[in-house]
């Protein structure tokens, strides 16, 4: 099938990095500067992505692959292929329409991106708060109050040791 197709369509012989030039008897012409073709047999090349402004070039465009961008320091990527750059905030903050705002009491954010999330409710699991939460850190839940009652031990005793070569009865 490939052989038949290439006999019918000379463009299928044009490799990545070229375009099939209809004006020149379908010869394979190199992509113009700042453009690329990532697959063979293309009749045009694609314009390279320009990483400008808040975008920074992570990988240069070549004749066979598009440029890849990331974000300048203080920003992070959003969207497929880093289509947007969003401002970083400090831990303990979230980005709002008015800029970075501290997390409200009872919420935290341990990253430079994303939103403030509520502290874990330890009591839902029947546990107590071992370490209080902050704007930057979630609470740490400890053992349940029942585990801490007098005479109760939170340490599980070790399993009895077996003698080598003896199977359990």
């Amino acid at each position: 099938f490939e052989r038949t197709r290439s006999l019918q369509d000379p463009c299928s012989n044009c490799p990545a990095g070229t375009f099939c030039d209809n004006n020149r008897n379908q010869i394979c012409s190199p992509c113009p500067p700042n453009s690329f073709s990532s697959a063979g047999g293309q009749r045009t090349c694609d314009i390279c992505r320009q990483c400008k402004g808040v975008f920074r070039t992570r990988k240069e465009c070549s004749s066979t692959s598009n440029a890849e961008c990331d974000c300048t320091p203080g920003f992070h990527c959003l969207g497929a292929g880093c289509s947007m750059c969003e401002q970083d905030c400090k831990q303990g903050q979230e980005l709002t329409k008015k800029g970075c705002k501290d997390c409200c009491f009872g919420t935290f954010n341990d990253q430079k991106r994303g939103i403030c999330r509520p502290w874990t409710n330890c009591s839902l699991d029947g546990k107590s708060v071992l370490v209080n939460g902050t704007k930057e850190r979630d609470v740490v839940c400890g053992p349940s109050p029942a585990d801490l009652s007098p005479g109760a031990s939170s340490v599980t005793p070790p399993a009895p040791a077996r003698e080598p070569g003896h199977s359990p009865q």
Partner: nanobody, 122 residues
Framework: EVQLLESGGGLVQPGGSLRLSCAAS????????VGWVRQAPGKGLEWVSA????????YYAESVKGRFTISRDNAKNTLYLQMSSLRAEDTAVYYC???????????????WGQGTLVTVSS
């Protein structure tokens, strides 16, 4: 009718210099992305240099960086390629080329004329 007429080629010794010219008619060079493409004997086409408005820059192939300089004279509607420190591997037919942008977002180029032959040999 759109035409590009290349001139200035010839025989030059290694280490020598040449200036190629490309006179445009039928369109305004200053409003286009234009450059030079070459074809060495028995080889494929290779982009040498270009003035790119969409990239906001001047492009040079790695093999000619620091040796070739592209420029244009808008008043004369002419594109130039100043070539110095020429090497045997620069021997090729040099064509003037215009980058073409298609409605669907694709890019190609077209070039006209017979080109101008540059031969670097001692």
């Amino acid at each position: 009718e759109v035409q590009l007429l290349e001139s200035g080629g010839g025989l030059v010794q290694p280490g020598g210099s040449l200036r190629l010219s490309c006179a445009a008619s039928g369109f305004t060079l200053s409003a286009e992305d234009v450059g030079w493409v070459r074809q060495a004997p028995g080889k494929g086409l290779e982009w040498v240099s270009a003035i790119l408005d969409f990239g906001g820059s001047t492009y040079y192939a790695e093999s000619v960086k620091g040796r070739f300089t592209i420029s244009r004279d808008n008043a004369k509607n002419t594109l130039y390629l100043q070539m110095s420190s020429l090497r045997a591997e620069d021997t090729a037919v040099y064509y003037c080329a215009r980058v073409v942008y298609h409605a669907g977002g694709g890019v190609t180029f077209d070039y006209w004329g017979q080109g101008t032959l540059v031969t670097v040999s001692s």
